[in-house]
Interface confidence: low
């Protein structure tokens, strides 16, 4: 093994390097000293380092480490941030188009139901957007509210246009009758199933992407432990104390130090792998009724079918509702 | 029969859109994202190695620093960590992660559980109980890939493609509908969102 080169007799090289780290401070000994106060760069002989220099090296080592960590995650972070933004925007646009399709269906097929239908459709799709973004809304309630609101308008405008406009009393009765008599058949339940499944998946997909960003941000801004700071200092800077300015750490040594410093971070690995594989599984299943684009853009058709179903059974329904809501109607006509 | 909100309905039931090769869709964009994410699947386990390879380490030099002294790069001493009697690396590794890391692990565990719960069983279209309740007509069969309608009259197949989505918007005629603030024709930036999904790297 070659003998170590003699330390810098004057500490001049060390001083000039250290001045770049800490301009104007006279912490570097003029000539090598015993260094008995050192805690990290424990000397085998005279050293050009002081306790204050060690502290500065530790700070610099930690900053280096933080920068290396941030540059390591930059590409991944950008990938997830960009995609989270793109998908969120795309989902919002799908919702907007789905709303427009539904409004157009009402305008073209049932002009007498507008503008009330537009209002109800607007509220429904606003709730859809809020749900996707994580709002605490029940999808079944959203769908029920849409059909509860639509039926009184369908009844008074399409099925029984002779009723007076001020049908406030009968409206409440009609909302109740809508569910009791299953006036839309199984369509509300079908829509509930399709919308809830597709929106749940969409929502969890966005949540997962946003958590991905949070994971990277967390590890991006990690602080390192004292022990890690000392090990990094010893690896990157202690050689300077011996005047060895150009020497680099051994590769195997670096790996050991990094594994020690990153022990906590590496614990994320298992869950990170699982996260990506679980996300892949979810994405593979995002089709048919689990694909919000597919479901929402077809809603206008299903809603149209549900209204046709009501019209097909209009005779039977009008008679039943006439009896059921007779009390409300009598009060209205008085 | 119903007047549908666009001219692309040929027979008023089935939406027929010519399939364009390499068309950018939401689902293809999702799959592309997953493929890119999978290239980062070992990100955390590879971090120590990555940082060493991006910080100064002796590669071509004969001598290297082992934390205590200058040694030959291929010697036994170089392989040792140079920390004997100073810091116990084992103890350092035994310490759990910093609390913020523990907290993020907990969040990952939670989202992974949710993702697994939400993953769709292969080959399922509708819940069994829905099929059993039955519809007036035209229930969806397993072989009907994109079936989303309820009754036969309004059955509709949708090609899940964003280009179709963007183009279709032009044919909607709700701009002049009273009480409807949403314009049917998407703004330029919306269309570019759809077409440029592939530009995100």
């Amino acid at each position: 093994q070659p003998p170590p080169p003699p330390p810098d007799a004057t500490c001049h090289q060390v001083r000039s390097f250290f001045q770049r780290l800490q301009p104007g401070l006279k912490w570097v000994p003029e000539t090598p000293v015993p260094g008995s106060d050192l805690q990290v760069c424990l000397p085998k002989g005279p050293t050009c380092c002081s306790r204050k220099m060690e502290e500065k090296y530790q700070l610099t080592a930690r900053l280096n480490m933080e920068q290396l960590l941030q540059s390591a995650s930059m590409e991944l972070k950008f990938l997830i941030i960009q995609n989270a933004a793109v998908f969120q925007e795309a989902f919002e646009i799908v919702v907007r188009h789905a709303k427009n399709y539904t409004n157009a269906m009402f305008k073209n097929n049932y002009p007498s139901l507008t503008p009330q239908a537009f209002e109800f459709v607007g509220e429904f799709f606003t709730d859809v957007s809020l749900y996707i973004l994580g709002s605490d809304i029940n999808v079944d309630d959203m769908v029920n509210e849409l059909f509860d609101s639509l039926f009184p308008v369908i009844y008074t405008q399409l099925m029984n246009p002779g009723l007076p406009d001020s049908a406030l009393d009968i409206n409440e009765c009609l909302r109740g009758a809508r569910r009791d008599l299953k006036v839309f058949g199984n369509f509300p339940k079908l829509i509930m199933t399709q919308v809830s499944k597709s929106l749940q998946v969409t929502r969890i997909f966005l949540q997962a992407l946003n958590l991905g960003i949070e994971v990277i941000n967390t590890t991006d801004h990690l602080k390192f432990s004292k022990d890690c700071g000392r090990m990094l200092t010893r690896m990157w800077y202690c050689s300077y104390c011996q005047g060895l300015m150009m020497v680099k750490p051994c590769g195997g040594y670096c790996n050991v130090v990094m594994q020690g410093c990153m022990a906590g971070v590496v614990e994320i690995d298992k869950y990170w792998r699982e996260y990506i594989l679980s996300l892949e599984e979810l994405v593979n299943g995002m089709y048919r009724i689990y694909d919000m684009e597919n479901v929402l853009l077809g809603l206008f058709s299903t809603i149209h079918d549900s209204i046709q179903y009501v019209q097909k059974n209009a005779g039977k329904l009008t008679t039943t509702i006439g009896k059921l809501c007779a009390h409300s109607q009598q009060r209205q006509y008085r | 029969s119903a007047y549908y909100p666009e001219d692309l309905f040929i027979d008023k039931k089935v939406l027929k859109v010519a399939h364009v090769e390499h068309e950018e869709t939401l689902s293809s964009r999702r799959r592309e994202l997953i493929q890119k994410l999978k290239s980062f699947i070992s990100f955390y386990s590879a971090l120590p190695g990555y940082i060493c390879s991006h910080s100064p380490v002796a590669e071509n030099d004969t001598l290297c620093w082992n934390g205590q002294e200058l040694v030959e790069r291929y010697s036994q001493k170089a392989a040792r960590n140079g920390m004997k009697n100073q810091f116990n690396l084992h103890e350092l590794k035994m310490k759990g992660p910093e609390p913020v890391v523990s907290q993020i692990i907990d969040k990952l565990k939670h989202i992974n559980q949710l993702l697994r719960t939400m993953s769709v069983p292969k080959g399922r279209v509708l819940d069994k109980n829905l099929d059993e309740e039955g519809f007036e007509s035209g229930d969806c069969g397993d072989d009907e890939d994109e079936c989303i309608g309820g009754s036969g009259d309004g059955m509709m197949k949708v090609k899940n493609q964003l280009r179709f989505l963007a183009e279709l918007a032009y044919d909607l005629d709700v701009d002049d509908v009273p009480g409807n603030n949403q314009q049917a024709t998407p703004k330029d930036n919306e269309i570019s969102t759809f077409h440029n999904l592939g530009n995100v790297h």
């Epitope: 502290e55 530790q58 700070l59 930690r62 602080k223 390192f224 432990s225 004292k226 890690c228 700071g229 | 035994m94 310490k95 759990g96 910093e98 609390p99 907290q103 907990d106």
Partner: antibody, heavy 124, light 108 residues
Framework: QVQLQESGGGVVQPGRSLRLSCAAS????????MHWVRQAPGKGLEWVAV????????YYADSVKGRFTISRDNSKNTLYLQMNSLRAEDTAVYYC??????????????????????WGQGTT | DVVMTQSPLSLPVTPGEPASISCRSS???????????LDWYVQKPGQSPQRLIY???IRASGVPDRFSGSGSGTDFTLKISRVEADDVGVYYC?????????FGQGTK
Amino acid sequence: QVQLQESGGGVVQPGRSLRLSCAASGFTFSSYAMHWVRQAPGKGLEWVAVISYDGSNKYYADSVKGRFTISRDNSKNTLYLQMNSLRAEDTAVYYCAKEGTYYYDSSGYWDYYYGMDVWGQGTT
Amino acid sequence: DVVMTQSPLSLPVTPGEPASISCRSSQSLLDSDGYNFLDWYVQKPGQSPQRLIYLGSIRASGVPDRFSGSGSGTDFTLKISRVEADDVGVYYCMQALQTPWTFGQGTK
């Protein structure tokens, strides 16, 4: 210095409600989990509830589950315990305690410590 | 729930003599990371509890080195090498491995 100050205790009839507060000072409240522990007259310590640093996770002792709710307002550095449907056996001194999880020294490095490292003086 | 059992429940000691308190858990408190999630607290007369030992054997800051914690898994011991008059109080062990956290009955 690090301090926890409980308040809100008092005498109420069984079945009624009470809300305890714990004002924290001298540390970054939003970084630490917080506990409520109680001690019935002449008896030992009984752990009641814990809330995570951000309020997202809460755990309760079986004896209070469904009746007590732990919450926190990080903007006010305050921990709360909402006690509903109170029973005679809930009579106790209630302590709030900070869970010591880690600390940062002056140079910004962190190190660990565990356990409930700071306790309030209690409210009855 | 994890049941914590302390013995003895009362321990008369003469100042200068050693003292030892045992704590047994109904299940292992050894975490997969190798930590024993057991803490020791003391409550002096008229005061709030204060932490003595955490993770089975680590002395809390400011605690005299007369106090030591040992043990692993289900059996733990708190030792005071030389008792002082100021050490009077009730000593509790507590497991923090899983919710609900549970205390021993206390040793006076």
